[in-house]
Every structure is written in C-alpha cells, then in structure tokens.
Amino acid sequence: DSSKWVFEHPETLYAWEGACVWIPCTYRALDGDLESFILFHNPEYNKNTSKFDGTRLYESTKDGKVPSEQKRVQFLGDKNKNCTLSIHPVHLNDSGQLGLRMESKTEKWMERIHLNVSERPFPPHIQLPPEIQESQEVTLTCLLNFSCYGYPIQLQWLLEGVPMRQAAVTSTSLTIKSVFTRSELKFSPQWSHHGKIVTCQLQDADGKFLSNDTVQLNVKHTPKLEIKVTPSDAIVREGDSVTMTCEVSSSNPEYTTVSWLKDGTSLKKQNTFTLNLREVTKDQSGKYCCQVSNDVGPGRSEEVFLQVQYAPEPSTVQILHSPAVEGSQVEFLCMSLANPLPTNYTWYHNGKEMQGRTEEKVHIPKILPWHAGTYSCVAENILGTGQRGPGAELDVQYPPKKVTTVIQNPMPIREGDTVTLSCNYNSSNPSVTRYEWKPHGAWEEPSLGVLKIQNVGWDNTTIACAACNSWCSWASPVALNVQYAPRDVRVRKIKPLSEIHSGNSVSLQCDFSSSHPKEVQFFWEKNGRLLGKESQLNFDSISPEDAGSYSCWVNNSIGQTASKAWTLEVLYAPRRLRVSMSPGDQVMEGKSATLTCESDANPPVSHYTWFDWNNQSLPYHSQKLRLEPVKVQHSGAYWCQGTNSVGKGRSPLSTLTVYYSPETIGRR
C-alpha cells in the first residue's frame, strides 16, 4: 500500500529485569526526511485531541531533544532509514507495547513493537534430534530468544552436572528478522550416556548462573553383554564339562534373541543364556561368545578361549627345501598337534636318534651329500609323548665330483692327427646328462663323454671337459702337446731402422712365431739361389743390384716352412742421367725440339732442373723441355739435373744443333 510507511523489525522482543533490549529496526517514510520522533510506552489514541497519550520514553524534534529518560533509552536511527532503539537497563514495567511515533514534513505514522520483560532470566530451550544412536554424531542445540549488545551472556553445556569436553559453537542474531543467542554442540554419544541428564546453562559474563534447561538422553544401543565361564581359566582336559553364562548389562530397546558362536560360527539349538558343554573333545577348543540382538542390532560379548588339552598327535616333518643343493642351508620342522604345545622333541636321521637335537626346528647351515636320507621326529608335552610319523626324505644334489679329461691316443701327437679324449667322473646327483669341452670347436662326439678331434691343429694346446647335471664341473685342462712345423715364418729387416740407402749396412732376420720341437735350421734364397744357412742375412754395403725378392725357410723334424717373398728396396740418388733429343740432336729452325731428362732413381725423380751451355737455369720444372719454335741461336749444349729424396744427379752435356731452314738460306 503506497499510503503506508514501511517498517521492518522483530514483532516481539524478550528480556528480563536489569538486562537490556536492543531493537533492530528499518523504515521508509512516505515523503522526505524524519522531522520528529517520539517513543511511547503503551500509547492510546485520544480521539478528542487527535493525539497519542502514554509514557514518553524518548523524544526528539527538529527543535531539539526532550531530556526524559534519554540516558536509558537511545534512538540509534537516522532521518530516513534506520530506526534502531536501545533500552538499558530494561525493567519489568517496560513490558507491553512500544510505540514509535514518526513525523515527516507532511506525513505521520505510529509503529508498534511488543516488549516482554520477565522478572527473572527465562530458560533457554534444548533441541534434540528425533532419535539418538550410539556412536552416531548428533548436534545438540540450545536456543535463547535474547541478545543485546549491552548485556553479554554465555551458554554452557553440562553432562550429569559436569561441563562437557566437546567444543560448542555459539552464534548470535541481532537483525530485523530475529534476535537470539544459540549454542550448538556436536557429540557422539556412547551407550553409557543413555538416561544421562544434559543441561544448557545460561550464565552472565562472569559465569554466574541465570537459568537453565535440561533433557534426559535416550541413546539407542545394541545389547551390552558379559560372559562368565566355569572353570574360570577355560582350560580343561578331554572329557571334562564346561558351563558358560551370558549376562545383559544394558539394552535399549529391549533385546529380542540370544545365540552362541564358536570361532565366529553360530552354534545350532543354543538359544538360552547358558551354554553347557559335557565331555568336551579337543575339537571343541576355540573362541566362544554370546550374541544378543535388539532393534538396533546384535551385540556380542568378549570372546572366551576354551582350551581342551591333549597329548601330541603323530608327528610329520616339513623340509625347507628338498631337494637341497650341497652347501646350502636346510631347516627341518617337526609338526605335531598338541595342547599345551610340545616342550621337547626327539629327532631321527635314517632311524638313528640325532644327539642334542630337542627343538621344534633343526637347522643345518651347510648341507653335505651325507646329510641325505629320512628325517622323523617325536613330540612330547605334559600329557604324554606322541608317536613317530612316517618322516620326510632329504635329497642332496651336487655337481659331478672328481672330473678328469683323459687322452686315449699314443704320444706324441702331431699336427693333423686324429685325437680321441674321454671325460670321466666319480659321482653325481642328479645323473650326468651332458658334457662340455673347452675350447669349442667343430669336433665330433661319437658317444656321450667322448670327443674326437679330426686333423688336430698346431694350436690345440690344452683341452678341458665338464660333466654336467644341473651344474657343470670342469676338469683340469690336459696338454695335447701337439708337434708341428715352424709357423709364421717371415723376413724382418733389423737394420737400418729406416729406409735402405745405397751403401748402407743391411741385416735381415728370419723370424718365426713358434716351432715344436724347438730345434730348427734356416735357409736364405734369392731368385731360387741359396744365399746362407744362418738366421740372419747381412750386407756390408748394399748396392741397387742387391734389390730383389728374398725368402727364408725354417725346418724342424716335422717339416719346413717358407716365408712370403720379401722385397728388398734400395734407395739411391738419381744416376745414369742423360739428355735425349726428339726428333734428334739436329733440328731445323722453326720446328719443335723436345729434350727429355732420362735417369735411374729410387724413389723416382721428383724435380728436374734444366741448364744451358753457360750453366744458366731454364724456367722448366718437368722431365721434358720443349722449344717451339726452335731458333738457330738455341744451338748449344744442354744438361739436366734430377732430384729425389736421397739426393741429386746430373747428366753430361748433350748438344742440340739447329740449322737454317731452306727459306732462310734462300733469303740470304
């Protein structure tokens, strides 16, 4: 309605004597700013005067404030939006209706707010969820319809009069919609909290009690049980009787069914609070408990461990591990059902008692072949001695022992012979299945453990064999001691260390890598001609004519071997130089004359130099000197010089004669 002023505030506010009240309030006037404000207590409209009568708690006009109870009552608003009020302290007789008389330039309005002030602090209100179950977290809420800035309060939670350990979250609201103080407590109740009293206590700032609210907890929980057994230690012998009783200490709601469990499995036809076991057997040993159910679920008692004692049963032996490898460790375990556990053991190896072995386990750190056989044991406890079981078999495996390689041939062996060898051994577990030979070769094995080497090589020095089961055992190598003709015969230059120059002293050595037998003879030859019978061939002063192809031979009682041909190269400076002329030493002028420098040199000539009859050098560096066109004045003696890495050589003079052409003679 556009003709109304618009106000927002809580409908009713609550407080108690001596506290305070804070009234959150907003408004919107019909026109303009607020010019006058009066706070009435229980206002009555007077029709005669057309004004409101009642106690004026606060007044403010454009002319200034009227000092009534100005200090106790405060207008905290403004001229256009806020109409918040505070009364501090508040009294019992403040209860009733507050009237906010508002006037603007042209409009007036009376807004009513209810105030409920009690004589004493009123109690807060505890809110509980509809159902509480053990161990499920719930939130307890304590609500008080009061909050005021000038009067701080606190809400505290108590369980059976004792402050609760859990941290509560307190919140306040002072808004135009609501005014309250609230405390929320998160809490996981246990079955033992059932029926306990929870209190929310209102306190002032100093912790002084103001009021409270209480509730009794109704915690739904499964039945809580206690089990009793006769005899109390639950240890009996076969044939004895046992009684177990189940007592319910608490259940909410009431229980509905009872049952008994052994090792987690339900016992049939046992639905009373007492379980009677007559003439028990060892099979009845185990963990017993009773189970009682209600609408929340089943509850179980603690377990009672019933032990039915008996003498050891026939024993078995477990071996870790069989078959065992020689040198490894092995553990034997004597297994026998008994209660109480056996206190003493007797061990047997192949029927014979093993001295000093009285434990459940026997450990052998390093197994040897003789440890193989049958192992059995006997267990003993306070009720008697068990029987010896069938025992377990230990198989000890090991590589072949005492392996040897044997040569079957008569000695000595010569290169090219056929050699037969056998591989022998003393014992093996498991059996030998194959043989290996070192070194490897394309050899034949005519039967298991026999090797045949056709055309034995000079370098077949030693042979070893291995006999193999799961492992291979190698024999020591045997020497074949093969005899052969000298090998790798070659010619080696001993001196000079560098290249051979004409005039040098030269020594050649006839080398070979090996010979068996060692006694040898030497022969040197060049072009099929025998030169000497020593290991060395010596030249005091080598000449170019000594160059050529040399071979040496070495022989022993088995045969003889020749070296590859070795080329002896003699380096020498250019020699036997001469100048040849083409087409001849007499040439007609105008034609072409070619002079060639011929020589014998090792290495070949690398540089040529040409000279005329006055020893003047001509600008040519090659073997041929070409004069074209040749002139009469070119007639004369020419010579050449050849150079290689060893030295220089020069030719004698060769004369070129250039004669006049018929044309020149004709012109004269």
């Epitope: 540089h607 130099t609 005329d612 009859w613 006055n614 003047q616 050098s617 001509l618 600008p619 560096h621 090659s622 073997q623 041929k624 070409r626 004069l627 002139k631 004045q633 070119h634 004369g636």
Partner: antibody, heavy 125, light 112 residues
Framework: EVQLQQSGPGLVKPSQTLSLTCAIS??????????WNWIRQSPSRGLEWLGR?????????DYASSVRGRVSINVDTSKNQYSLQLNAVTPEDTGVYYC?????????????????WGQGTMVTV | QSALTQPASVSGSPGQSITISCTGT?????????VSWYQQHPGKAPKLMIY???NRPSGVSNRFSGSKSGNTASLTISGLQAEDEADYYC????????????FGTGTKVTVL
Amino acid sequence: EVQLQQSGPGLVKPSQTLSLTCAISGDSVLSNSDTWNWIRQSPSRGLEWLGRTYHRSTWYDDYASSVRGRVSINVDTSKNQYSLQLNAVTPEDTGVYYCARDRLQDGNSWSDAFDVWGQGTMVTV
Amino acid sequence: QSALTQPASVSGSPGQSITISCTGTSSDVGGYNYVSWYQQHPGKAPKLMIYDVSNRPSGVSNRFSGSKSGNTASLTISGLQAEDEADYYCSSYTSSSTLVYVFGTGTKVTVL
C-alpha cells in the same frame, strides 16, 4: 720498386694485328732469373696465359697452343721493354691484356709466380 | 688444357674463416709445388697473395694462408674483413705440352 707500364691501342678491327708494349722499370728484361709474360682476361675464358720471353745465354720464348702460329713476343733491350703481337684477331680476342713478371728464384730455392703485373689494357676487337 | 676448378662463390661474416679450393691434376697442382693465389678487385690488376703453395710475399696479411693435398690446393682467409671482398684466382705450373701456366676459374668472395 719494379713496375710494368703497358701501352697500345684499345680498339682493333677484325683480321688486323693487335700490338701492345710493356715497359719495365726497376728490373732488366735481360735478367737471367725472370721471365716476361703476357696474360689476358675475358668473361668467357677467365685468366689465360698467352706466352713468355726470357734471356739466358740467348733469347727463348714459349706460347700457349691456343694462340701459337699467330702470336709473337719481341724485345727491345735498348728501351728495356717487350711487346705482344697477335695477328688475325677476331671478336673472341676481346679482353683485358696484362703483362707480368715471373720471378723464378726465391733466395736459393726455385720459385714460380707472377709477382708484378702491368695495369692492364682493355682491347676490343 | 682445361682450367683449374674453383667454387664460383664463397661467403662469410666479418671475423669468420673461409677456405677456397682449387682442384687440378697430377700434371699441374699435384705434380709441382708451384701453386700461387691472386686477389683481384674490380677494375684492378691481379695481386699476388700466396706463392709456391704456402709462401706469403712481404706486405700480405698473415690472415691469408695456403696449403695443398694431392691434386687440390686451398686458400684460407681467417678473420674475414670487408676489404677481402674480391675475386680470387689460383695458378699452377703445368707439364702440359699446350701451356706452361694454367689459371683457376675464379671465386667471388662476399663479406656478409
């Protein structure tokens, strides 16, 4: 300092004779450790050695086979100069012509390089 | 007699090193140690830079060096400078019956 100064016409008609002269200063045409060369350069043939003359106990000359028969190198010892004559020229003989010295000894060892060049003459046929 | 073979062009940035190759036969480059190298700027006569494979005439910078392997000679210019931009020719004595000297095809060096 050795210098070579070239002279001669820059334009020659086809079939005529091309004549160029190279005057030597700072060295002698009679030197027995030098040769005196003619080299030409054209875009189509690059640098091309044509011939040389030199004096030892007498005068010698060598020519490239590409011009042999129509080339001659002459010496005027009195003027310390040498010249190139190329007969029966064709447009293929167009190019820059250089005279150059080849010094054949570098101390005691043999050498061979064109160490001094003339300024070059552009000849158009 | 065909000319000695050189790459048509080689380029490099200032301060870099470049190498020019010159390939002949056993009758020229491979047979004699008389290989020389010439620098030619546009409109100018060639200038001798290296003679007898690896010798430098006085006045030529030591940034220029020469070498030979088999039938191939090489000119290396290290610490390239702007003034090195020019044409470069190799030359060799030859035992050919048609010539006494043979020149290379020439290489244009560009400084980037």
